[in-house]
Amino acid sequence: AGVFELQIHSFGPGPGPGAPRSPCSARLPCRLFFRVCLKPGLSEEAAESPCALGAALSARGPVYTEQPGAPAPDLPLPDGLLQVPFRDAWPGTFSFIIETWREELGDQIGGPAWSLLARVAGRRRLAAGGPWARDIQRAGAWELRFSYRARCEPPAVGTACTRLCRPRSAPSRCGPGLRPCAPLEDECEAPLVCRAGCSPEHGFCEQPGECRCLEGWTGPLCTVPVSTSSCLSPRGPSSATTGCLVPGPGPCDGNPCANGGSCSETPRSFECTCPRGFYGLRCEVSGVTCADGPCFNGGLCVGGADPDSAYICHCPPGFQGSNCEKRVDRCSLQPCRNGGLCLDLGHALRCRCRAGFAGPRCEHDLDDCAGRACANGGTCVEGGGAHRCSCALGFGGRDCRERADPCAARPCAHGGRCYAHFSGLVCACAPGYMGARCEFPVHPDGASALPAAPPGLRPGDPQRYL
């Protein structure tokens, strides 16, 4: 384990012509903050992919208001380091993304408005425990100067923070199988530290941070017993989740749950809800005390000191049931946006997005017009996952590639003749009719049935109808 540290030295206009406009103004003062995202290896991943090594957000910088007429200076920065703790080994090679964000401090409804000002990315090799490395990155007309390093947190040492050292218990030698810790000869290598919570009885590790299970146990922390109960008249191939399939047309037929447990069907098989005092896949394990660890998902066991007294599981938030075995319905909070369908998978929430939307919470409205060109001066109009072109006069079709015939719809009334024109169409009216579309009859006495004159025009004034 250790910490990646990032120190921002300056953020301001880069060298060369075309200095950027100040991100803040007298009308809209703002302040900066930074976000760093780290990924292991030299991957060229998208900015949106998870920051597998970790991420951090800086404090907000001082409020900045532009001085009119002055060139954009280096902008005031937040105090302190950005620190990204890493729990496992430092990979040695890593990719970084550093984003500069602007927080506008106007009177926005619903809190301050954030916008991304600049994003820089890079791939570097770095040994833990080494000196600060300096770097300059440019994003458009902006320049970011920063330093970074990785350091191990005791008792970890080494270029990858994988060797663990502790002070010697005896002055002369280290314990059995443990070597001195070079260059700290007065310290000894310590035994491996498995993943936090890994069962000391049923789990072990060969690398720091892992948890491998002994036979008969499963789960991320090796705390879940693998069911050994036999299958009755198996109906099909054995299931990886339960070890067997239940006979009959439905998984709950004949109630496979023992000791008064109630059965409910799941997409793959069935699930037993056990009465207090029993647990296991089919509620087959009884005489349970708190020493048996009957409370799942971090539940706290109270009472049940001997097999005859009942225990009670106090469940952590997010879990319920007599053994804290059930999750609360988190989808009722409707976290998915834009009409996405929420799925609670247990380990995570997932959103199934409607067409035209994407992202973990369907928060991204897909740019339907991206890469779609409308020909002949047409403009692209987005809408619900599809795009259409609004074509310039004289063109039609999906992409405005077809030359439209403005006369095709026979727009001239009362037998008028239509002529296509570069600016649209012109109607030559039959005798006795007038108007842009020959829609008005001319009365025999010379008066026309024109609409009433708009306000400000006297009936005798000339009017244009196009």
């Epitope: 992919s49 920051c51 957000l57 409707q334 998915c336 946006r337 929430l349 973990p360």
Partner: nanobody
């Protein structure tokens, strides 16, 4: 890591009022959805009121017109104003939040809960 800290629970008489608050802190980039659940003894946990991912408010039928949820975005805090309280509102009230973390992942978090007791 993200923490949700609830406060404002307590004992009140029927018809009385309480205001719960829940403050989120930690590695938060943005809060997508946030609200209040409750769990009465021997009952399933249920949503009381919340701000959904789309920003709209949602209330359980049993509290409509009596409870009001509000928020202070700058403080990453939600409030539940409970009035005309009834005995059946007695429960542990949990704050819940669907949070976008600094690493762009989304995670769902729960507070530790605050007890609301309504009795004459």
């Amino acid at each position: 890591e993200v923490q949700l800290v609830e406060s404002g629970g307590g004992e009140v008489q029927p018809g009385g009022s309480l205001r719960l608050s829940c403050a989120a802190s930690g590695s938060i980039f943005s809060i997508n959805a946030m609200g209040w659940y409750r769990q009465a003894p021997g009952k399933q946990r249920e949503l009381v009121a919340g701000f959904t991912g789309d920003g709209s408010t949602k209330y359980a039928e049993s509290v409509k017109g009596r409870f009001t949820i509000s928020r202070d975005n700058a403080k990453n805090t939600v409030y539940l104003q409970m009035s005309s309280l009834r005995a059946e509102d007695t429960a542990v009230y949990y704050c819940a939040a669907d949070v976008q973390l600094l690493n762009s992942d989304y995670e769902f978090y729960w507070g530790q809960g605050t007890l609301v007791t309504v009795k004459p």
